[in-house]
């Protein structure tokens, strides 16, 4: 129960976050206007990653498309990157989960292929979480050298007789939306390879029986670990995802209660 | 076509408020636009006295900002200037004016002559 | 406050000659942001309100006469009257729309010579 809820809520709080990276992505407000010392003005400049707006106090919005791919910024296009391989991943894996939810059936599905697609849908949020924190970060540090770089040359005097104010940028509302978002897909993708624990199944329910050689202490159960050689078929048990990677030693120090000499 | 409208006293004794009331036909004044006031001293130049806009916020010259009030009605769809203390040098043609695009005034309304005196 | 300074103060022009209007701003008119002037000129007829003749200092509203263009950028604007008929006689105003409180020139007063 507490596995079908772990993988549920992994799923729900996934999805909100790729909700938001979409919609961090697609916003208008990366950057906006720096209102220093101004508080009310006039014409209000605001920047997306696609395009840049212009919005008049007197309640004319304008938006242009950057119609240019060679002439924009290489942090900007890296940005654009990877919010689209965040919102992608996010997507695959919104996908792959939907079919490992515990909670739906899908033909004979084993609880080993729900295991590994939970497994694999954690890891693709994680890293589409990830995506969507840096490329944030990324533009947020851009703005920052930009904002510093602006304000010591804030007015650029034409002969020393005329003042011409420069525009600084700050952080926009689609940053917090995209940190937040990132952060909440990031989360979401950790509760599912939790969830994925606990969805491997348990130790077979077939009697295992450990033969004892005298000078080794190797149990031998069949299915119960997959070898090397490949014995050790998995067909039956169902047991495809193993905890952690254990050594002969350390399985045999964990007997099934079912075990017997 | 939007049309504006300018009504009140024509005559108002110093240190009273003035007020006028700018009626709009045409255009609701809460979808859009800038709802300004602006003065013109007999003779002299144009004057900003300030806006309410389309979502009610307002912005006033700080020349008259102690004194202005602008408010509007939605029901009548009316927007109105509110001056007090006045004196004689706030004798002038008081026009109600739409901005938009470029913030510039693209609609007025005829205007009409305030004269403070006692 | 940005201060607006119209040169001329009067202008007389014959029938069909251009007449040229200056205007220069304290500060730069020019928005980084979508690379337009918040400039606008207006024509004042006797016993009549503004009308808006440009805006984004060259931008010609709907329904003005192509002999009326505005041109200029950052703090020297010009509004020009390629060929001067008798219906333009009145006075002419420019005015900025880039900061609080907008403010307009004086204004030039265009006469037939």
């Known amino acids: 129960m507490a596995v079908t809820a772990c993988q549920g809520l992994g799923f729900v709080v996934s999805l909100i976050g790729i909700a938001g990276i979409i919609a961090a992505t697609c916003m208008d407000q990366w950057s906006t206007q720096d209102l220093y010392n101004n508080p009310v003005t006039a014409v209000f400049n605001y920047q997306g990653l696609w395009r840049s707006c212009v919005r008049e106090s007197s309640g004319f919005t304008e938006c242009r498309g950057y119609f240019t791919l060679l002439g924009l910024p290489a942090m900007l296009q890296a940005v654009r990157a990877l919010m689209i391989v965040g919102i992608v991943l996010g997507a695959i894996g919104l996908l792959v989960s939907i079919f490992a939810l515990k909670c739906i059936r899908i033909g004979s599905m084993e609880d080993s292929a729900k295991a590994n697609m939970t497994l694999t849908s954690g890891i693709m949020f994680i890293v589409s979480g990830l995506c969507a924190i840096a490329g944030v970060s990324v533009f947020a540090n851009m703005l920052v050298t930009n904002f510093w770089m602006s304000t010591a040359n804030m007015y650029t005097g034409m002969g020393g007789m005329v003042q011409t104010v420069q525009t600084r940028y700050t952080f926009g509302a689609a940053l917090f939306v995209g940190w937040v978002a990132g952060g909440l897909t990031l989360i979401g993708g950790v509760m599912m390879c939790i969830a994925c624990r606990g969805l491997a199944p348990e130790e077979t329910n077939y009697k295992a029986v450990s033969y004892h050689a005298s000078g080794h202490s190797v149990a031998y159960k069949p299915g119960g670990f997959k070898a090397s050689t490949g014995f050790g078929s998995n067909t039956k048990n169902k047991k495809i995802y193993d905890g952690g990677a254990r050594t002969e030693d350390e399985v045999q120090s964990y007997p099934s209660k079912h075990d017997y000499v | 076509q939007v049309q504006l409208q300018e009504s009140g006293p024509g005559l108002v004794k110093p240190s009273e408020t003035l007020s006028l009331t700018c009626t709009v036909s045409g255009y609701s004044i809460t979808s859009n636009y800038a709802w300004n006031w602006i003065r013109q001293p007999p003779g002299k130049g144009l004057e900003w006295i300030g806006y309410i806009n389309y979502s009610g916020n307002t912005n006033y010259n700080p020349s008259l900002k102690s004194r202005v009030t602008i408010s509007r009605d939605t029901s009548k769809n009316q927007f109105s200037l509110k001056l007090s203390s006045v004196t004689a040098a706030d004798t002038a043609v008081y026009y109600c004016a739409t901005s938009y695009y470029g913030n510039s005034f693209i609609y007025w309304g005829q205007g009409t002559l305030v004269t403070v005196s006692s | 406050d940005i201060v607006m300074t119209q040169s001329p103060d009067s202008l007389a022009v014959s029938l069909g000659e251009r007449a040229t209007i200056n205007c220069k701003s304290s500060?730069?008119?020019?928005?980084?942001?979508?690379?337009?002037?918040?400039l606008a000129w207006y024509q004042q007829k006797p016993g009549q309100p503004p009308k808006l003749l440009i805006y984004w200092a060259s931008t010609r509203e709907s329904g003005v006469p192509d002999r009326f263009s505005g041109s200029g950028s950052g703090t020297d604007f010009t509004l020009t009257i390629s060929s001067l008929q008798a219906e333009d006689v009145a006075v002419y105003y420019c005015q900025q729309a880039y900061s609080f409180p907008w403010t307009f020139g004086q204004g030039t007063k265009v006469e037939i010579k």
């Open positions: 500060q730069s008119l020019l928005n980084s942001g979508n690379q337009k002037n918040y």
